[in-house]
């Protein structure tokens, strides 16, 4: 080994070196939280970049860059260090227009903490292992969601566009002429029935067990879907999102009420099956796999 490499190895294995890097990262994180940093922090930034560059150079000199088995780039944790340094120099010396987007990558410096703290490294390792084991469960989950999304698509396509429409028009107005001019919230509120405090027109349906319109209003299929057009079963992707929402139970009762009002109470069966299978079974299956992966990692 050359004298330079010997010195690099000595520095690398020294506990003070690890302490220096850890303190640098933590101090850097504190500086990153500053709202309006003063001008002198720019010099501190350069110091941090210098320390990180020194750390990487020491590692490269001690272990080699990428050819051997235990070299710098063969360790995935060092990829993070390498990316942090590359972005530090990119944002500083290269004019890339929208620098603020690139500066976001400075946050990756906080992740360097993981590679320095051994306990944290183990936990993250376990997390990565659990993600690998989750692949089968994820495939099953996506498959189940896709199947139910397709069923939802067939059952409820376009149903959430059903609205209660006013039964009195001007002489020159017809349904189609109104459909072509509906734009503002004011227009919608003029022609459709809104419950007090509601941001969406009252939903209705054409089957006997679906929601009915109040007197002076008729059910029609016009305009956009509820929740600014984000809640619907009109395409596979929107249906998939709705099913994901049911699985995660994210304000699912609102989606349930909207759909039942537009399609009919019979379709409650669909929601019961999805909640039982998606929300109770699949979610717990995912948790079980994660728990197993942690258990294996601990052993």
């Amino acid at each position: 080994f050359s004298p330079l490499r010997r010195i690099s190895i000595k520095i690398l294995v020294h506990s003070l070196f690890s302490m220096l890097i850890m303190c640098t990262i933590l101090t850097n994180c504190i500086f990153m939280t500053m709202n309006n940093p003063p001008d002198w922090t720019k010099n501190v930034e350069y110091t941090f970049t210098g320390i990180y560059t020194f750390e990487s150079l020491v590692k490269i000199l001690a272990r080699g860059f990428c050819v051997g088995e235990f070299t710098f780039l063969r360790d995935p944790w060092n990829w993070l260090d390498f990316v942090v340094i590359v972005f530090a120099y990119l944002t500083e010396f290269v004019n890339l227009g929208n620098v603020s987007a690139l500066r976001t990558f400075r946050v990756l410096r906080a992740l360097k903490t993981i590679s320095v703290i051994p306990g944290l490294k183990t936990i993250v390792g376990a997390l990565i292992q659990s993600v690998k084991k989750l692949s089968d469960v994820m495939i099953l989950t996506v498959f189940c969601l896709s199947v139910f999304a397709l069923i939802g698509l067939q059952l409820f396509m376009g149903n959430l566009k059903h609205k209660c429409f006013r039964n009195s028009l001007e002489n020159n107005e017809t349904l189609e002429s109104i459909m072509n001019t509906l734009e503002s919230e004011e227009d919608f509120r003029k022609y459709f029935y809104y419950l007090e405090g509601s941001k969406d027109a009252l939903l209705c349906g054409f089957s006997t067990d679906s929601g009915q319109c109040p007197e002076g209003y008729t059910c029609v299929k016009i305009g956009r879907n509820p929740d600014y057009g984000y809640t619907s079963f009109d395409t596979f992707s929107w249906a998939f999102l709705a099913l994901f929402r049911l699985m995660t139970q994210d304000y699912w009762e609102n989606l349930y009420q909207q759909t039942l009002r537009a399609a009919g109470k019979t379709y409650m069966i669909f929601f019961v099956v999805v909640i039982f299978l998606g929300s109770f079974y699949l979610i717990n299956l995912i948790l079980a796999v994660v728990a197993m992966a942690y258990e294996e990692q601990n052993q």
């Epitope: 149903n159 039964n167 028009l169 349904l175 459909m179 054409f206 002076g216 008729t218 029609v220 299929k221």
Partner: nanobody, 124 residues
Framework: EVQLVESGGGVVQPGGSLRLSCAAS?????????TGWYRQAPGKQRELVAR???????QYADSVKGRFTISRDNAKKTVYLQMNSLRPEDTALYYC?????????????????WGQGTLVTVSS
């Protein structure tokens, strides 16, 4: 294709009467906001004559008020226009309009669905 069947048109003398019928008998017609009669005289724009909403309330053009009466038979899915005291200026092609929701089998669709038209001629 959705079809409205119109009938009852013909030639009549001034002061005479006619009864027009518009049948939306197809199962595709689900629910209307209104079903109405419109007319188009040669060289003129199509205008509203009368319409009846699904709850039974009616609306008439000023020129026909007191002379024409619109009614509906929900069981037969038919709308009638009883035209009395006809005048030469009532001569036109009368169209039936179903403004509401139809079923395509796969989904519901709302819009305006027009008939082919029936000719009413008032002359001596």
């Amino acid at each position: 294709e959705v079809q409205l069947v119109e009938s009852g048109g013909g030639v009549v003398q001034p002061g005479g009467s006619l009864r027009l019928s518009c049948a939306a008998s197809s199962r595709q017609f689900i629910r209307d906001v209104f079903t109405g009669w419109y007319r188009q005289a040669p060289g003129k724009q199509r205008e509203l004559v009368a319409r009846i909403y699904n709850e039974g309330n009616t609306q008439y053009a000023d020129s026909v008020k007191g002379r024409f009466t619109i009614s509906r038979d929900n069981a037969k899915k038919t709308v009638y226009l009883q035209m009395n005291s006809l005048r030469p200026e009532d001569t036109a092609l009368y169209y039936c309009l179903f403004s509401g929701t139809i079923s395509t089998g796969r989904e519901y669709r709302s819009g305006d669905y027009w008939g082919q038209g029936t000719l009413v001629t008032v002359s001596s």
